[in-house]
């Protein structure tokens, strides 16, 4: 419905005018396009006005005082539906002695400039010119709601019209709609819905999975308390007013669950004692991942099957598994958790560490002089298999010869077969210091503790061997 209040609408003499005055202003209309500024030349400046009335000091030739200038009363309140057209106006009679006047439209305290449909019409007479400023909106929107006034400037004085209140009514408009949520199973939560008119009041119905929740409507705003859900649901709210109903967006309320296992695992890099892995997390179960667990077990069927567990933060989906044996095969699984619990472990994947340099030196190194052949015999025990960190390809022997003022170091490489070597005596009456390191394709391991033997001058016999004890034999 459209209504105007508090003033009745009288048919005016000019097309589109909404005015309360029956008396025609002029009989001969003279229309112009939109001209916010109108020029009249006063013979003498006016003085400040009170309210929307200007009381000019100028008097005519007959010295009659001029009436105060004011906009005529017009319609005070226009109610109409969205998308309808509306036209309203201000009218004023201005003595012809005034020039340099300006009429402008203002809405809610801000001047309306630019592309507005404002037209000013002039109706000149002998003594006064009637001015009608019309404002039209072809298809009103809610944003057109507000208080409109005309302002007219005469001699730096401002005359202000009574406000015209435009009230655009339509379907309810949501100012707050329910939001999607992830909730714990069987736990209460709230949804909020707020809508406004005009027209008011706005009543709210809640809808769950296409069925109404409340039989009686609630006045907007409305808060729905859901006692708990066991499965995903879609909620929306209906806002009703005299113009009809508007339905909010449907929001999905998800039930938090344990996450899905990772969808990918990548072996990024392997060393002798570590494997760098990354993974792509699976579906998070509507709850952020907290941390992840990397499970590692030896893939060797003869191993005891014990599982090593490495816990890490959920980000950055990357972890370096350390303290692994060299040249070993491992099965790796990844699982991640959220607030609800742990995902299943990903399918087990296979990864291997590379060959490394041995981590310990050969054991029980024994050195003795074989004087008859002028050689030094060296014997040792290979490092324990687990600490070889690969396949032994041989040994490196360092022997340093020291006598008065002379020192020279020699290196020998020997094959992996056996655990003995023979080196030629380099210097007599000198000390020979021997150290041995095991070698794999992964590199050279640490050297054993030095073992010293004195090489006497020719003819002096000493067969006593020198040795390093095996661990635990000291």
């Amino acid at each position: 419905r459209e209504e105007a209040k508090p003033y009745p609408l009288f048919p005016g003499p000019f097309p589109g005018s909404l005015q309360t005055d029956h008396t025609p202003l002029l009989s001969l209309p003279h229309a112009s396009g939109y001209q916010p500024a109108l020029m009249f030349s006063p013979t003498q400046p006016g003085r400040p006005h009170t309210g929307n009335v200007a009381i000019p000091q100028v008097t005519s030739v007959e010295s009659k005082p001029l009436p105060p200038l004011a906009f005529k009363h017009t319609v005070g309140h226009i109610i109409l539906s969205e998308h309808k057209g509306v036209k309203f106006n201000c009218s004023i009679s201005v003595p012809n002695i005034y020039q340099d006047t300006t009429i402008s439209w203002w809405k809610d305290g801000k001047e309306l400039l630019g592309a507005h449909h404002a037209i000013t019409q002039f109706y000149p007479d002998d003594e006064v010119t009637a001015i009608i400023a019309s404002f039209s909106i072809t298809s009103v929107q809610r944003s057109d709601n507000g208080s409109y006034i005309c302002k007219m400037k005469i001699n730096n004085e401002e005359i202000v019209s009574d406000p015209i209140y435009i009230e655009v009514q339509g379907l309810p408009h949501f100012t707050k709609q329910p939001e999607s949520m992830n909730v714990t199973r069987n736990t209460a939560f709230n949804l909020t819905c707020q809508a406004v008119g005009p027209p008011e009041p706005v009543n709210i119905f809640w809808v769950q999975n296409s069925s109404r929740v409340n039989e009686q409507p609630e006045k907007s705003p409305s808060v729905l308390t859901v006692p708990g859900l066991t499965e995903m649901a879609v909620f929306s709210c209906e806002a009703h007013n005299d113009k009809g109903l508007t339905v909010s967006k449907g929001v999905q309320i998800n039930i938090k669950a344990i996450p899905s296992p990772p969808t990918e695992v990548s072996i990024r890099n392997s060393t002798a004692h570590s494997i760098l892995i990354s993974w792509v997390p699976g579906f998070d179960g509507y709850s952020p991942f907290r941390n992840c667990s990397i499970q590692v077990k030896e893939a060797d069927p003869l191993s005891n099957g014990s599982v090593m567990i490495f816990n890490t933060s959920a980000l950055p989906h990357l972890y370096q598994i350390k303290q692994l044996q060299a040249l070993a095969n491992y099965s790796i699984g990844v699982s991640c958790m959220n607030e609800i619990g742990w995902s299943a472990v990903s399918p087990w994947i296979l990864a291997s560490t590379t060959e490394g340099a041995p981590s310990v030196a050969p054991l029980n190194v024994t050195v003795f002089l074989n004087e008859s052949s002028d050689n030094v015999d060296i014997r040792w025990m290979k490092p324990p298999t687990k600490q070889q960190d690969g396949e032994l390809v041989g040994y490196r022997i360092s022997h340093v010869w020291q006598s008065a003022g002379i020192s020279k170091e020699l290196l020998e490489e020997v094959g992996q077969n056996g655990s003995r070597a023979r080196i030629s005596v380099q210097v007599h009456n000198a000390t020979c210091t021997v150290r041995i390191a095991a070698v794999t394709r992964g590199g050279v391991g640490p050297f054993s503790d030095p073992v010293k033997i004195f090489i006497p001058a020719h003819g002096w016999v000493d067969y006593a061997p020198s040795s390093t004890p095996a661990p635990g034999n000291a």
Epitope: E264, S266, P347
Partner: antibody, heavy 128, light 111 residues
């Protein structure tokens, strides 16, 4: 609802090129590896190619050079570019989600664990 | 390239029968168990039935079961239902190779 929809199939002359698309809904290509599989009329299934969530690609040896897998994660769509088509490429082409995938970046290969969601397929006919 | 060989290629059976399909690999499947079984009906895409040789995919009836490790695998339907007449494929991956191999298929038809 999780869904895969293939498109782009049709009749093509030998030597021609075609690009198939696989539109994904209900999950993200940035979280799942995807694969193409084909099936010639009356024949069995034949794996073509895989693209991991990060964009690494691996193909069957017979497909390398002629078939290229790619994706646009912003459009949640995967593609198969097929060049130098032959009569024996006539088949229904399926896209499928890889349920789990292990990648061996240092050795440039990866292994599919399972294909857990399939599209309806699009028919490509290569004929003069 | 590794190959998966299914047998039989065709199998005639009646509703209620116990049906067994075998899948043999020319070399060990990755991790000895990364073998899957798929069911396909005419004009439809394949559907995952079993993965990890013996784990049932979501929504698959318990009358389907899988077993095996390494190179020998079996799919069993304990009591054939009218909806089970279809073609079944095994598939798996191998270490050191990106290829995902499919078996030749076994068509289960009504006797």
């Amino acid at each position: 609802e999780q869904q895969l929809v293939e498109s782009g199939g049709g009749l093509i002359q030998p030597g021609g090129s075609l690009r198939l698309s696989c539109a994904v809904s209900g999950f993200s290509l940035s979280s799942n590896a995807m694969s193409w599989v084909r099936q010639a009329p009356g024949k069995g299934l034949e794996w073509i190619s895989i693209i991991s969530s990060s964009g690494s690609t691996y193909s069957a040896s017979w497909a390398k050079g002629r078939f290229t897998i790619s994706k646009d994660s912003s459009k949640n769509t995967m593609y198969l570019q097929m060049n130098s088509l032959r009569a024996e490429d006539t088949a229904v082409y399926f896209c499928a989600r890889v349920g789990f995938f292990v990648g061996y970046g240092a050795y440039d290969y990866g292994i599919i664990h399972r294909l857990d969601l399939w599209g309806q397929g699009t028919l490509v006919t290569v004929s003069s | 390239d590794a190959q998966l060989t299914q047998s039989p290629s065709t199998l005639s059976a009646s509703v209620g029968d116990r049906v067994t399909i075998t899948c043999q690999s020319s070399k060990s499947i990755y991790n000895n168990n990364w073998l899957s079984w798929y069911q396909q009906k005419p004009g439809k895409p394949p559907k995952l039935l079993i993965y990890d040789a013996s784990d049932l995919a979501s929504g698959v009836p318990s009358r389907f079961s899988g077993s095996g490790s390494g190179t020998e695998f079996t799919l069993t339907i304990s009591s054939l239902q009218p909806d089970d007449f279809a073609t079944y494929y095994c598939a798996g991956g191998y270490s050191g190779d990106s290829d995902y191999a499919f078996g030749g298929g076994t068509k289960v038809e009504i006797k």
